[in-house]
């Protein structure tokens, strides 16, 4: 007996062909004996079986001798033996229909579960294998979980069923609601302009939530809500919004957030959260700001950090093309009675430079410059 | 809901190879045969050919012989060669999906050939 | 192959009538066949299929009868959207053929 596997939705063909080059009589019947659809001559007729509306056959290829059976929005019931009789001889084929599904929906957040259900008719003893965009293999029976999703978990999951040594395959696409980055660093001198960005790893016909960002200033005790602010189709509302610092929100997508100052007593590290409609938990996004000031009191030349910085990080003071003065793994670096020109001060990890401020040492009979 | 997407080169010289790709989109390829039809001005509405899933073929006796109509599963695409094109070939070439009758229809790629 | 001819070619009609298109083969092609209707820079629409059967999506003011070589097409009360081009298919033998279309234009 032929063996035909099946897709739920999909459509199937089940072949049937006489040794004769020519149009001539053929039924198909299912295993009670219904007939399902057959010729008088040139016409198609059908029998009473359920499948009547979805179930056709191709006139053109009668003419070589096949009459298939073609079965539309197949359906798990559809598993069943069919029985093609022409020529005085019987064809059986056996279709098994499967289905495979995402647990609830296919736009999960970072984080949460995935579990793909298989459905098979019953006496089938299939075994699925998927394979998950980022080329991760995982198998099952009837049911797959894969926990903690990540955010190249998006993209098309493919699953192959095997079943009597055939294969059907199935392609899930899974899209992981996440921000792009976990978390990001803006460096900043006092006194610019701070832009904060956060961008969204999927892009979605509607997009509804509310968010929020709450901070942590390295100089508090305690953290703080900003801003907070609504989502509705893709645009932005702000509901809510601090005096100090008096942050500005862009309008469109993606969240894009202005601090007209980078302050000392601003520095520090934000948590953005996005609650989306019809979700269960939230998206985060962790930010952290940097402020470098570098100043002169008196005889004494000061270049300070506030926020979170990593202890690899290098804090110099420098005059103009010379050898650094000053070189330290602190948040603070000085130098006492500084020659006069041009000194910067630069925070730098590895030799990479991350922030730079510069400052004018006027000849001791002067106050200084800051440029 | 099916819907067909279909690409390939507009202007061709004589005596080159028209190539065509269709791409299914919201749905497989299993169960339905797969055709390629042309239109032009002169010869109307003129099937080419089709294929199916498995890669059987049927063409139009009156083009056979420069003729190959190829699928790729793995993409959900299937794609029409033409080889040794002449004036007579400028048409309007369409993709579409049949069982007996054409449902759905790409969009039509114009295919002109000029020396 | 199987010739399909359809008649008139073209034909002039107002909002709300009635109008017939004829298409025969020739040969007997039992009820495998089917209308289309195609408006300039777009593909055909599939509007009748089994010479009588209403294609999903299409509206009641289109039928189609006939079988072996005589068919009709018949749009009970035209709207604007209705002119256009209509093509007949036999899907009886390959090659898969089409008449050369029946072009309904405004009176």
């Known amino acids: 007996k032929k063996v035909v596997l099946g897709k739920k939705g999909d459509t199937v063909e089940l072949t049937c062909t006489a040794s004769q080059k020519k149009s001539i009589q053929f039924h198909w019947k299912n295993s009670n004996q219904i007939k399902i659809l057959g010729n008088q001559g040139s016409f198609l007729t059908k029998g009473p079986s359920k499948l009547n509306d979805r179930a056709d056959s191709r006139r053109s290829l009668w003419d070589q001798g096949n009459f298939p059976l073609i079965i539309k929005n197949l359906k798990i019931e559809d598993s069943d033996t069919y029985i093609c009789e022409v020529e005085d001889q019987k064809e059986e084929v056996q279709l098994l229909v499967f289905g495979l599904t995402a647990n609830s929906d296919t736009h999960l957040l970072q984080g949460q579960s995935l579990t793909l259900t298989l459905e098979s008719p019953p006496g089938s003893s299939p075994s699925v294998q998927c394979r998950s965009p980022r080329g991760k293999n995982i198998q099952g029976g009837k049911t797959l979980s894969v926990s903690q999703l990540e955010l190249q978990d998006s993209g098309t999951w493919t699953c192959t069923v095997l079943q009597n040594q055939k294969k059907v395959e199935f392609k899930i696409d899974i899209v992981v609601l996440a921000f792009q980055k976990a978390s990001s660093i803006v460096y900043k001198k006092e006194g610019e302009q701070v832009e904060f960005s956060f961008p969204l790893a999927f892009t979605v016909e509607k997009l509804t939530g509310s968010g929020e960002l709450w901070w942590q200033a390295e100089r508090a005790s305690s953290s703080k809500s900003w801003i907070t602010f609504d989502l509705k189709n893709k645009e932005v509302s702000v509901k809510r919004v601090t005096q100090d610092p008096k942050l500005q929100m862009g309008k469109k997508l993606p969240l894009h957030l202005t601090l007209p100052q980078a302050l000392p007593q601003y520095a520090g590290s934000g948590n953005l959260t996005l609650a989306l409609e019809a979700k269960t938990g939230k998206l985060h996004q962790e930010v952290n700001l940097v402020v470098m000031r570098a100043t002169q009191l008196q005889k004494n030349l000061t270049c300070e950090v506030w926020g979170p910085t990593s202890p690899k990080l290098m804090l110099s003071l420098k005059l103009e093309n010379k050898e650094a003065k000053v070189s330290k793994r602190e948040k603070a670096v000085w130098v006492l009675n500084p020659e006069a020109g041009m000194w910067q001060c630069l925070l730098s990890d590895s030799g990479q430079v991350l922030l730079e401020s510069n400052i004018k040492v006027l000849p001791t009979w002067s106050t200084p410059v800051q440029p | 809901q099916v819907q067909l997407q279909q690409w390939g080169a507009g202007l061709l010289k004589p005596s080159e190879t028209l190539s065509l790709t269709c791409a299914v989109y919201?749905?497989?390829?299993?169960?339905?045969?797969w055709s390629w039809i042309r239109q032009s001005p002169g010869k109307g509405l003129e099937w080419i050919g089709e294929i199916n899933q498995s890669g059987s073929t049927n063409y139009n006796p009156s083009l056979k012989s420069r003729v190959t109509i190829s699928v790729d599963t793995s993409k959900d695409q299937f794609s029409l060669r033409l080889t040794s094109v002449t004036a007579a070939d400028t048409a309007v070439y369409y993709c579409t999906r049949v069982l007996n009758w054409f449902d759905p229809w790409g969009r039509g790629t114009l295919v002109t050939v000029s020396s | 192959d199987i010739q399909m001819t359809q008649s008139p070619s073209s034909v002039s009609a107002s909002v709300g009538d009635r109008v017939t298109l004829t298409c025969r083969a020739s040969?007997?092609?039992?009820?495998?066949l089917a209308w289309y209707q195609q408006k300039p820079g777009k593909a055909p629409k599939l509007l009748i299929y089994?010479?009588?059967s209403l294609q999903s999506g299409v509206p009641s003011r289109f039928s189609g009868s006939g079988s072996g070589t005589d068919f009709t097409l018949t749009i009970s009360s035209l709207q604007t959207e209705d002119f256009a081009t209509y093509y007949c298919q036999q899907a009886n033998s390959f090659p898969y053929t089409f008449g050369q279309g029946t072009k309904l234009e405004i009176k």
């Open positions: 040969q007997d092609i039992s009820n495998w």
């Open positions: 089994a010479a009588s």
């Open positions: 919201g749905g497989s390829l299993s169960g339905y045969y």
